[in-house]
């Protein structure tokens, strides 16, 4: 169908648009386009025939429309008046019309906005500010960013005035930030420059830091203090009550005891001439030593070796603690700890043993943390992996296998192809493979440290035909309205179409049918006995298609409610009584009789001759279905007349 | 200003055929298509068909298939409307009319053909 | 192919009234609808192409509307010149259809 395609849709005033066509006729006689929706005359713009190769201006010909051989027009310099539908007549050899019919809107050039404000130094919970984006433009959509971000939602900012005024109401220091305008519409987006809302706060109660008011001796004392401030604080330390300093930092190298006692850091905002101080208590300690690991055993074999790791130095009535990757130690019957918690004893190392370890000496200051440990654990190689899983190629492709196993040194690689050992590396390359190239492609891994080998055999079919598929499934016997299947359409093939049929129909539309893995697989949710049928699935490609042998499901159901025939109550005295009882149910039932209450018989006919009026009462038929795991029963009442 | 000029009035005996011819003037012959119509007398217009000079592909009216083969000869800037096995009915004044991006809108003045035993 | 049918298929009026022939199409051909001028002895004039657009030199008391299947030639104030068969033809589909004409007499 021949269509108008406008590049761009919405044009910028002074460029241009190209309305483009699409699915143009062969065999052309000529074209003409028109201004609006239909084919007038007085609204031609430009024709063209195509013989001629010439082109006629019409009365809507502005000068700045330029048609090409493809029929499609460009047009220079838009101007607001060209907003609206354009329509492409084209006659055919055959004198057989067609038109088609395309359209663009015109919108100008947005200018660069700018912000102004109100109040260029608020207060913080006293003052507000409006901030404006100017200028004002018709059709132009406002918006708003607070450093980059779109506005946060508070209900201390309003947009008004068409979004193009945005208030903060009782301004806060968070509202310090970079604010830009936007203006909008479909041909250009231009933001402002940033405006910084400078907000006038503080000082806040000091912080001082580090918060630890336990040192060593010997160690360095660095105190730094800050309190939230705009313009920001002037700062005075005071050692037991005696000034020190005006900064913001109070450095005391090598502490001693003596340096134990009160500090307190005051924080000064000339703006607003507010003090605010805090004071901390600092205790200094005598010094314990750095304590570090040793270990008996540096490369561990996984599941064969222990590890048994000591904290040193050894120190009397010192309490020794571990870190297991930054975190204490598991509960795990492979970790032992000695009694004094000195060592740490690893049975039968795993890979996922590594570590890191530390250990730490703790004191009535702090807990001394030695340097990190890591185990080199030794393992593999795993059995290796083959990717991609694709068994079946078509001849000429390429084929490229890689081999991974985990395993620690990293595994040496080897490749056989039918037993024959091809390289040494962890991927296979061969190009444009034919069906010479099918095989088994053993991937063999070698750990050099653990002498381990692990390897993995893979066939591998070159085949123009398409093997024939088989079905495989996740559950042989599924149970209705419970159970879900899966069938996996085998093998996986590289540019192959997988179809299925169920009763030799194509798949029934159904919620509970559902396609995936590339049609690879086709799952039923809740099967029910009506899914009881025969599946095929099939493959193809451009060369070949080939159909799976059918799978039949076995659906357990049941057993449903029972029915007991004949449906007469009602018997004359000395006739036989022949109960026949019937569920449907896969596997089949198993029937039990009970009357009035009494178990009877595990048949599903029960047989009373000669009855009396003695056998009046209540028949009930129970059913079990084993599989299911499913019961069910029906009462009947029996009146026998003398 | 285009201008089509057609060949004199013709008698002919039915059975036999008729060519009638079409010269352009005043404008390019190949711009545009050229059709032929008739009016029988008391009739109605009546499309038969139409060429495209520059190509020579032509079209016709069904009635008309096989009877009629309309023809152009780009040097001389002439077409040619051919109708053979001719009978009584086929009297009638044959247009030629030039076709562009709105149907015909020129005609050449007309020719008559008389078919008469 | 598409049948196009006028009425009336003659009319009689006065120079000075206001004249309206209609003309239908058995489908839609769009705007693909010219009328014509047929005087005897004379060749067919374009008045009106694609439906609404005046031919150049035709007077404007000539006017055409429609769209679709139904169209309409309108002559404002009929001149003693206009006494002709007017005729309509769509070019919607390359086997161009006439209208059978519309004969218009004097009075």
């Known amino acids: 169908k021949l269509t108008i395609e406008s590049t761009p849709f919405n044009v910028a005033e002074g460029k241009e648009v190209l309305l483009l066509v699409h699915n143009l006729p062969q065999h052309l006689f000529g074209y003409s386009w028109y201004k609006g929706e239909r084919v007038d005359g007085n609204r031609q713009i430009i024709g063209y025939v195509i013989g001629t190769q010439q082109a006629t201006p019409g009365p809507a010909y502005s000068g700045r429309e330029i048609i090409y051989p493809n029929a499609s027009l460009l047009i220079q310099n838009i101007i607001q008046n060209d907003t609206g539908f354009y329509t492409l007549h084209v006659i055919k050899s055959d004198l057989v019309n067609e038109e088609a019919t395309g359209q663009f809107r015109v919108y100008p050039e947005l200018p660069k906005p700018s912000i102004s404000s109100n109040n260029s130094k608020p207060v913080e919970d006293k003052d507000a500010v409006a901030f404006t984006c100017e200028p004002e433009t018709q059709d132009a959509t406002y918006l708003w960013w607070v450093n980059n971000q779109s506005l946060p939602v508070s209900p201390r900012l309003q947009l008004s005035n068409g979004n193009r005024t945005l208030t903060l109401f009782n301004v806060t220091r968070n509202d310090t930030a970079s604010y830009k305008c936007e203006t909008q519409n479909p041909v250009s987006a231009r933001r402002s420059d940033s405006v910084i809302l400078n907000v006038l706060y503080g000082p806040d109660a000091p912080t001082i830091s580090p918060l630890n008011t336990s040192y060593r001796s010997g160690e360095n004392l660095n105190l730094s203090c800050h309190a939230a401030s705009n313009p920001p604080a002037q700062y005075s330390w005071f050692v037991n009550g005696t000034f020190q300093q005006s900064t913001q930092e109070l450095f005391i190298p090598n502490i001693t005891v003596n340096n134990s006692g009160s500090y307190t850091c005051q924080a000064h905002n000339s703006d607003t001439g507010l003090n605010r101080t805090t004071v901390t208590t600092i205790t200094v300690y005598a010094e314990p030593p750095k304590p570090f690991i040793t270990s008996n055993n540096s490369n561990p074999v996984e599941d064969e070796d222990a590890v048994a790791l000591t904290c040193e130095p050894e120190i009397q009535n010192t309490t020794y603690l571990w870190w297991v990757n930054n975190q204490s130690l598991p509960v795990s019957p492979r970790l032992q700890l000695s009694n004094d918690n000195r060592t740490l004893t690893l049975l039968s190392v795993t890979r996922n043993d590594v570590g890191p370890y530390e250990c730490g000496i703790q004191n009535e200051l702090s807990v001394d943390h030695s340097d990190p440990v890591i185990l080199n654990v030794l393992y593999g190689p795993d059995d290796p992996t083959i990717s991609p899983s694709y068994t079946y190629y078509r001849p000429g492709v390429n084929l490229s296998l890689s081999c991974h196993a985990a395993s620690n040194p990293p595994a040496q690689y080897s490749w056989l192809i039918d037993g024959n050992i091809q390289q040494h590396t962890q991927e296979l390359f061969i190009s444009n493979i034919t069906e010479k190239n099918s095989g088994l492609y053993t991937c063999q891994a070698n750990n050099s440290a653990s002498g381990h080998s692990r390897t993995t055999v893979k066939t591998i079919t070159v085949s123009a035909e398409l093997p024939k598929p088989s079905i495989s499934s996740n559950n042989s016997k599924p149970v209705e309205d419970k159970d879900a299947v899966a069938f996996t359409c085998e093998p996986e093939a590289q540019n192959t179409t997988y179809l299925w049929w169920v009763n030799g129909q194509s798949l029934p539309v159904s919620p509970r049918l559902q396609l995936s893995n590339g049609n690879r697989t086709l799952t039923l949710f809740n099967v029910t006995r009506n899914d009881a049928r025969a599946y095929v699935c099939g493959i193809q490609n451009s060369v070949s298609a080939n159909r799976s042998d059918p799978v039949t499901l076995d659906v357990l159901y049941g057993p449903d409610t029972p029915i007991i025939s004949p449906p007469d109550s009602s018997y004359l005295s000395g006739a036989n009584l022949n109960l026949s009882c019937h569920s449907a149910s896969n596997p089949s039932p198993q029937y039990s009789w009970r009357i009035n209450g009494i178990p009877q018989q595990h048949t599903q006919v029960l047989f009373i001759a000669k009855i009396t009026p003695n056998n009046n009462g209540t028949y009930a038929c129970f059913v079990s279905n084993l599989a299911t795991g499913r019961n069910n029963s029906i009462v009947k009442s029996i009146t026998v007349s003398a | 200003q285009v201008q089509l000029v057609q060949s004199g009035a013709e008698v002919k005996k039915p059975g036999s055929s008729v060519k009638v011819s079409c010269k352009a003037s005043?404008?390019?012959?190949?711009?545009?298509?050229i059709s032929w119509v008739r009016r029988a007398p008391g009739q109605g217009l009546e499309w038969m068909g139409h060429?495209?000079?520059?190509?020579?592909?032509?079209g016709y009216a069904q009635k008309f298939q096989g009877r009629v083969t309309i023809t152009a000869d780009e040097s001389t800037s002439t077409a040619y409307m051919e109708l053979s096995s001719l009978r009584s009915e086929d009297t009638a004044v044959y247009y030629c009319?030039?076709?562009?991006?709105?149907?015909?809108?020129?005609w050449g003045q007309g020719t008559l053909v008389t078919v008469s035993s | 192919d598409i049948q196009m049918t006028q009425s009336p298929s003659s009319l009689s009026a006065s120079v000075g009234d206001r004249v309206t022939i209609t003309c239908r199409a058995s489908?839609?051909?769009?705007?693909?609808l010219n009328w014509y001028q047929e005087k005897p002895g004379k060749a067919p004039k374009l008045l009106i192409y694609?439906?609404?657009s005046l031919q150049s030199g035709v007077p404007s008391r000539f006017s055409g509307s429609g769209s679709g299947t139904d169209f309409t030639l309108t002559i404002s104030s009929l001149q003693p010149e206009d006494f002709a068969t007017y005729y309509c033809?769509?070019?919607?589909?390359?086997?161009?259809?006439f209208g059978q004409g519309t004969k218009l007499e004097i009075k």
């Open positions: 009319a030039r076709y562009r991006f709105y149907g015909i809108d020129y």
């Open positions: 005043g404008g390019t012959f190949h711009d545009g298509a």
């Open positions: 060429i495209i000079p520059i190509d020579g592909t032509a």
């Open positions: 489908q839609s051909i769009s705007s693909y």
């Open positions: 694609a439906a609404s």
């Open positions: 033809q769509q070019w919607r589909s390359h086997l161009f259809t």
